[in-house]
Interface confidence: medium
């Protein structure tokens, strides 16, 4: 069955200064490729976390994404402020050349 990206929480309420946990799981290991988290959708969406590369000091992963069989792509965002409000999407990419291709969004 084709991979699904599941974000089970419709909304997450967090007090200022606290940590937000954004849950995301994939239903399959195939296709191979990284997960990215974005705030918003469209060309102007904001990258929150990239499994493959980059430095995201406020973000930690809930599980160890380096493990081959991991399908939990949940993240924690620390020190939440009102400016962090918005809709967050967990997006699965398919490995491609030269660039990875967006495959499915939560």
């Amino acid at each position: 069955e084709e991979l699904q990206v599941i974000q089970p929480d419709k909304s997450v309420l967090v007090a200022a200064g606290e940590t937000a946990t954004l849950r995301c799981t994939a239903t399959s290991l195939i296709p191979v490729g990284p997960i990215q988290w974005f705030r918003g959708a469209g060309p102007g969406r904001e990258l929150i976390y990239n499994q493959k590369e980059g430095h995201f000091p406020r973000v930690t992963t809930v599980s160890d994404l380096t493990k081959r069989n991991n399908m939990d792509f949940s993240i924690r965002i620390g020190n939440i402020t009102p400016a962090d409000a918005g809709t967050y999407y967990c997006v699965k990419f398919r490995k491609g050349s030269p660039d990875d291709v967006e495959f499915k969004s939560g």
Partner: antibody, heavy 124, light 113 residues
Framework: QVQLVESGGGVVQPGRSLRLSCAAS????????MHWVRQAPGKGLEWVAV????????YYADSVKGRFTISRDNSKNTLYLQMNSLRAEDTAVYYC?????????????????WGKGTTVTVSS | DIVMTQSPDSLAVSLGERATINCKSS????????????LAWYQQKPGQPPKLLIY???TRESGVPDRFSGSGSGTDFTLTISSLQAEDVAVYYC?????????FGGGTKVEIK
């Protein structure tokens, strides 16, 4: 020729459900993202929802999130909008529209083909 | 959500004269990766669905007369009808597609003076 034809509109009571359909012809339906856009009587345009060409991604306006579901059947060249928990403010002409972005484009840049619309009236 | 503000609400122009419609977005719709503004213009005649005129702020859709032109970048955009024809009487909408939800301006009604 390229055509979109909506159906399924009508008069419905608040809290009830309705399913709109949009039949596509004249182009490769499975290669295009599709939208629903609505227009309340005498008002402007309001985007409702979009679905990717392959159904993989769906996005909704906040005003309908959790109540409306967009879906498609590429084998039938048909787009759907399941509308639940309808409210008076959902009263509008509902248009389906083709996304200019196809399977090869990440993001749309306009809606280039529109149906004539189907009217939904929510009233007790 | 990005708010799109159109001005004026309505416009009366003599046949053959220039009509100018403005659209301002509450944040930039310029995508730095491809240097394109994700802004479209539509024409809606009474009793008809909208018709795409312009995309990427200034690219004319196929089949649209060249009297229609779009300009601007970032947050400020303009639709110009260089020589108004009777068939141009309609409501014109701008729309941003940079951040979902794609949002429309309130519309500008163009009439013959």
């Amino acid at each position: 020729q390229v055509q979109l034809v909506e159906s399924g509109g009508g008069v419905v009571q608040p809290g009830r459900s309705l399913r709109l359909s949009c039949a596509a012809s004249g182009f490769t339906f499975s290669s295009y993202g599709m939208h629903w856009v609505r227009q309340a009587p005498g008002k402007g345009l309001e985007w409702v929802a979009v679905i990717w060409y392959d159904g993989s991604n769906k996005y909704y306006a906040d005003s309908v999130k959790g109540r409306f579901t967009i879906s498609r059947d590429n084998s039938k060249n048909t787009l759907y909008l399941q509308m639940n928990s309808l409210r008076a403010e959902d009263t509008a002409v509902y248009y389906c529209a083709r996304d200019t972005g196809s399977a090869t484009t990440m993001w749309l840049y306009g809606m280039d083909v529109w149906g004539k619309g189907t009217t939904v009236t929510v009233s007790s | 959500d990005i708010v799109m503000t159109q001005s004026p609400d309505s416009l009366a122009v003599s046949l053959g004269e220039r009509a100018t419609i403005n659209c301002k977005s509450s944040q930039s719709v310029l995508y730095s990766s491809n240097n394109k503004n994700y802004l479209a213009w539509y024409q809606q005649k009474p009793g008809q669905p909208p018709k795409l005129l312009i995309y990427w702020a200034s690219t004319r859709e196929s089949g649209v007369p060249d009297r229609f032109s779009g300009s601007g970048s970032g947050t400020d955009f303009t639709l110009t009808i260089s020589s108004l024809q009777a068939e141009d009487v309609a409501v014109y909408y701008c729309q941003q597609l940079y951040i979902y939800p794609p949002t429309f301006g309130g519309g500008t009604k163009v009439e013959i003076k």
